[in-house]
């Protein structure tokens, strides 16, 4: 509950938040897990902590971890972790499941699109928007405060949305980057790309050792009946029947629940008897269907003792 | 600051038009929102006219209500009252450059509009 | 258009007590933080008090606390002063169409 997976690319900026919340006037350690290592907070340092910010300034490949956040206040503190993930910059325009954000949906009115962690950011508008990496134009478009605005929002509307903008620090600017995908709505059956609504991306199960684990991959694929959409678990980029893990095996949820009218599928994936070497382990969730494929990571990690009182 | 005037007793049907003056800030740097609050009930969002002067309209509000604006204010047109549109009307402020649409920071003292025949 | 379900009212609080107030969304907020907090007394226009979700309001006392994300929220008043009785509403704004929706209000009375 108390970690929070981050990501972002290289030469950009990415800022991030200790997913513990506190007071202002709390003070707010940052200390790099692997090393135990403090965090400097002098602005001149390229990483440095501001209350209960990170600031990577740019960020660096190298930079990836997991950070921990302590908030301190006088009666207690708490403990959050920050997993960070810095990408190398694509060549080409397609962005991968890991770089995206979370999903929106629009309908026929007008729609917005909000520029995914832009309140971490000082930055001034106004935004640059992308559709499928090409600059939006046209009067439909119109980039206001930290969103994008189509009206008339139409099917082919549907699609990845870039948003660019400058993080303004100390007088330096670093650009950032965020992609999200965006949905439309509408009356008439129709299929889309597969979403992927759990796990979360690069999403961290913490579980016990000796118990039992349940993950369930969970994704839609449009509207009315789909002529060919499926949900799978893959260990290591195997198939869980050529595993052959016995205690890992994997059973459909509901087949084809229509929540707001969305087709969508579930697959569980149980594992018995959890063992240290299931933590080592890479989980895909794998979604697809006439549009292709998108897959979400998981990985296992063992359950921290409970926050105490200090 | 922000101002509302033009609140009266009208008769249903009868078009009304409120005027919401500002003074300390740019209508080219915010976006301005109606509100209003019936007696003894809670608020209830109208609509907006934005930096850009797009408009935009709660869905029950659409057809009811124009919202337009010059320079130094911001007009509220009730285009046939009724009964229901008793109510005090307020005019805010949303925070420049802030990345939402929900935070009013600036809010005038409201103006009572009274339908009835 | 999305409905957000406020705590009931009234609800009491002891001066120096702490109060919540939740607010449900029945869709996710725009970017899971368009939310914001308000207070109003008889007779005068609201005051905002947090906004994107956790954010305190300039000159707002410390003692308000806004937290949550995506559909559920809430507003914590601790240390609660007898100047703090009023309704609250939430207010949220939307990624589909350009709807805003303020929550039904929470009374809370302080005694």
């Known amino acids: 509950k108390f970690s929070k997976q981050s990501w972002g690319l290289e030469n950009e900026a990415l800022i991030v938040r200790c997913p513990r919340q506190g007071k202002p006037s709390y003070t707010v350690d940052w200390y790099y897990s692997q090393t135990n290592k403090s965090i400097p907070t002098q602005e001149r340092n390229r990483v440095f902590a501001s209350g209960q910010l990170l600031k990577f300034l740019p960020a660096a490949v190298a930079d990836s971890g997991i950070y921990t956040c302590i908030v301190r206040s006088p009666t207690f503190n708490r403990t959050g972790y920050a997993n960070v993930t810095i990408y190398k910059k694509q060549s080409d325009c397609n962005v991968p499941d890991y770089l995206m954000y979370s999903t929106v949906s629009g309908s026929e009115k007008n729609s917005k699109i909000y520029c995914p962690t832009i309140d971490l950011y000082n930055w001034t508008a106004p935004l640059e928007w992308f559709k499928n990496c090409q600059a939006l134009q046209g009067s439909r478009y119109r980039a206001h405060k930290s969103f994008l605005v189509i009206d008339n929002v139409m099917t082919e509307d549907a699609g990845d949305y870039t948003c660019k903008f400058i993080h303004n620090e100390n007088g330096a600017n670093y650009s950032v980057t965020a992609t999200r995908s965006f949905t439309v709505k509408d009356e008439q059956g129709f299929s889309l790309f597969p979403v992927i609504g759990a796990p979360a991306q690069n999403e961290i199960k913490e579980v016990e050792i000796g118990k039992n684990a349940n993950l369930t991959c969970s994704a839609c694929f449009g509207k009315g009946t789909q002529f060919l959409a499926a949900v799978l678990w893959q260990l290591n980029g195997t198939k869980i029947t050529d595993f052959g893990e016995p205690r890992i095996q994997q059973e459909e949820g509901q087949n084809q629940s229509f929540s707001n009218g969305l087709a969508c599928l579930d697959m569980v994936l149980r594992i018995a008897d959890v063992k240290e070497e299931d933590l080592l382990l890479q989980y895909d969730c794998l979604a697809l269907n006439l549009h292709g494929l998108r897959r979400h990571t998981v990985r296992l990690s063992r359950k921290n003792p409970i926050d105490h009182h200090s | 600051s922000v101002e509302e005037s033009g609140g009266r007793l009208v008769t249903p049907g009868t078009p009304l038009t409120l005027t919401c003056t500002v003074s300390?800030?740019?209508?080219?740097?915010?976006?301005m929102s109606w509100v209003r609050q019936a007696p003894g009930k809670g608020l209830e969002w109208i609509g907006y006219?934005?930096?850009?002067?797009n408009t935009y309209y709660a869905s029950w509000a659409k057809g009811r209500f124009t919202i337009s604006k010059t320079s130094t204010t911001v007009d509220l047109k009730i285009t046939s009252p009724t009964t229901e549109d008793t109510a005090t009307y307020f005019c805010?402020?949303?925070?420049?450059?802030?990345?939402?649409?929900?935070?009013?920071?600036?809010w005038g003292p409201g103006t009572l509009v009274t339908v009835s025949s | 258009a999305a409905v957000l379900t406020q705590t009931p009212s009234p609800v009491s609080a002891a001066v120096g007590g702490t109060v919540t107030i939740s607010c449900q969304s029945s869709?996710?907020?725009?970017?899971?933080?368009?939310l914001a907090w308000y207070q109003q007394k008889p007779g005068q226009p609201p005051k905002i008090l947090i906004y994107?979700?956790?954010t305190l309001a300039s000159g707002v006392p410390s003692r308000f606390e806004g937290s949550g994300s995506g559909t559920q929220f809430t507003l914590t008043i601790s240390d609660v002063q007898c100047d703090d009785a009023a309704t609250y509403y939430c207010?949220?704004?939307?990624?589909?169409?350009?709807?805003?929706?303020f929550g039904g209000g929470t009374e809370v009375v302080v005694k």
């Open positions: 207010l949220g704004g939307y990624d589909d169409d350009a709807d805003n929706t």
């Open positions: 994107k979700a956790s």
């Open positions: 869709q996710s907020v725009g970017n899971n933080n368009d």
């Open positions: 805010a402020r949303d925070q420049y450059r802030s990345s939402g649409v929900s935070d009013y920071d600036i």
């Open positions: 300390g800030f740019s209508l080219s740097s915010h976006d």
């Open positions: 006219i934005w930096s850009d002067d």
